[in-house]
Amino acid sequence: GIAIPRNSGCPNSEDKNFPRTVMVNLNIHNRNTSTNPKRSSDYYNRSTSPWNLHRNEDPERYPSVIWEAKCRHLGCVKADGNVDYHMNSVPIQQEILVLRREPRHCPNSFRLEKILVSVGCTCVTPIVHHVA
Amino acid sequence: GIAIPRNSGCPNSEDKNFPRTVMVNLNIHNRNTSTNPKRSSDYYNRSTSPWNLHRNEDPERYPSVIWEAKCRHLGCVKADGNVDYHMNSVPIQQEILVLRREPRHCPNSFRLEKILVSVGCTCVTPIVHHVA
């Protein structure tokens, strides 16, 4: 990891607890003021590899609601709206961090958890042609 | 929010600090044992809307390294390898949670932050605006 100079104004922590347990302020700061994520909201319908969004809810997790993309087709959609059997719709997955209540039901104690979510779909060629 | 029954085994917290500040265990639990995200790692090259991955590093953030997708083309790639400018490559964006050191340089104090990242690209039909 990167060595970070200790700031004298930092909350105190015992070495045995670092970096296992830290204090986190849940007043979320949103850095996305300049970008409107709604603008990409219709891509799921207009894509050649369209997807549906499924709500995944878990009250023991923060955020409690995560939207999972499921590709609508196995193939990709041609200009005429029909399937192209030569191309495949595949999910684009990303590992994200969430907070998991631990112990369960505790309102102020969490553990970091990595989960894999499907964010959307893309259209790929199924075969990679190897040139001799 | 959902009311969660308080478990008597929970770490104590004063009302004035809840839910603003919570304890988070940084020993990450990885739920992705059954899925291998590496397998989708070549989609960026095989997609009709291929992308490059750019490393975004910030030592004041956890995770400190995030990979950002940038679409290679404005249009989409046809079967013959040429770009179809009647279609658009667009980034699929997702809001993710990260931990921001606050105060700066403090090793054990963070604030939750939402950032918008581009995960990959998809090929969409452009919106045609018809003039009356």
Partner: antibody
Framework: EVQLVESGGGVVQPGRSLRLSCAAS????????MSWVRQAPGKGLELVAI????????FYPDSVKGRFTISRDNSKNTLYLQMNSLRAEDTAVYYC?????????????WGQGTLVTVSS | DIQMTQSPSSLSASVGDRVTITCQAS??????LAWYQQKPGKAPKLLIS???SLETGVPSRFSGSGSGTDYTFTISSLQPEDIATYYC?????????FGGGTKVEIK
């Protein structure tokens, strides 16, 4: 109950033509992808043709491309396979099969099959 | 075309035995694999799709696993009614192709 019933098989000479039909019932035919799959006597399974739910997309493997044509009449709930320029190696039981989705990728229901024998 | 190599081509096992069939694709098929059961003189029956998803009504003694190029079909406890030939099929790249089949017999 889903039912697929093939017909039109028989003995035919090399170079001749034959048309197979598959009558579907028990489901909304027009919303499912369909395929023809064949099985030579004592052999494994081979894809012959695929058609999507509305007939707008089709696929043929090289072994039958240019000789066979898959089509469907959704108003009659019927799938067809027009086979021209038949060869001895086309001898097989021909099954029509339904994809559980729109397009024709894998097959959750199959007919009982119809035997096509190409022989002089 | 993607080649699907199924093994063994035949096997003989006792009732109650665990039976395993493997299917190897010539390249990654990204879990787009189906398994079928075909009894003599009958049409094939779909058992599993997506490499692991059991079709409705299929007994839980059947299961599928694997990823990439290597997939496995398992019967946890062989029953007399499981006597059949089993086929794998990839649907990642056209033309969809089938394995050569595995004939399962009772000892």
């Amino acid at each position: 109950e889903v039912q697929l019933v093939e017909s039109g098989g028989g003995v035919v000479q090399p170079g001749r033509s034959l048309r197979l039909s598959c009558a579907a019932s028990g489901f909304t035919f027009s919303t499912y992808g369909m395929s023809w799959v064949r099985q030579a006597p004592g052999k494994g399974l081979e894809l012959v043709a695929i058609i999507n739910h509305n007939g707008g997309s089709t696929f043929y493997p090289d072994s039958v491309k240019g000789r066979f044509t898959i089509s469907r009449d959704n108003s009659k709930n019927t799938l067809y396979l027009q086979m021209n320029s038949l060869r001895a190696e086309d001898t097989a039981v021909y099954y029509c099969a339904r994809d559980p989705r729109h397009d024709g990728y894998f097959f959750d229901y199959w007919g009982q099959g119809t035997l096509v024998t190409v022989s002089s | 075309d993607i080649q699907m190599t199924q093994s063994p081509s035949s096997l003989s096992a006792s009732v109650g035995d665990r039976v395993t069939i493997t299917c190897q694709a010539s390249e990654d098929i990204y879990d787009r694999l189906a398994w079928y059961q075909q009894k003599p003189g009958k049409a094939p029956k779909l058992l599993i799709s997506g490499a692991t998803s059991l079709e409705t009504g299929v007994p839980s003694r059947f299961s599928g696993s694997g990823s990439g190029t290597d997939y496995t079909f398992t019967i946890s406890s062989l029953q007399p009614e499981d006597i059949a030939t089993y086929y794998c099929q990839q649907y990642w790249s056209v033309p969809w192709t089938f394995g050569g089949g595995t004939k399962v017999e009772i000892k």
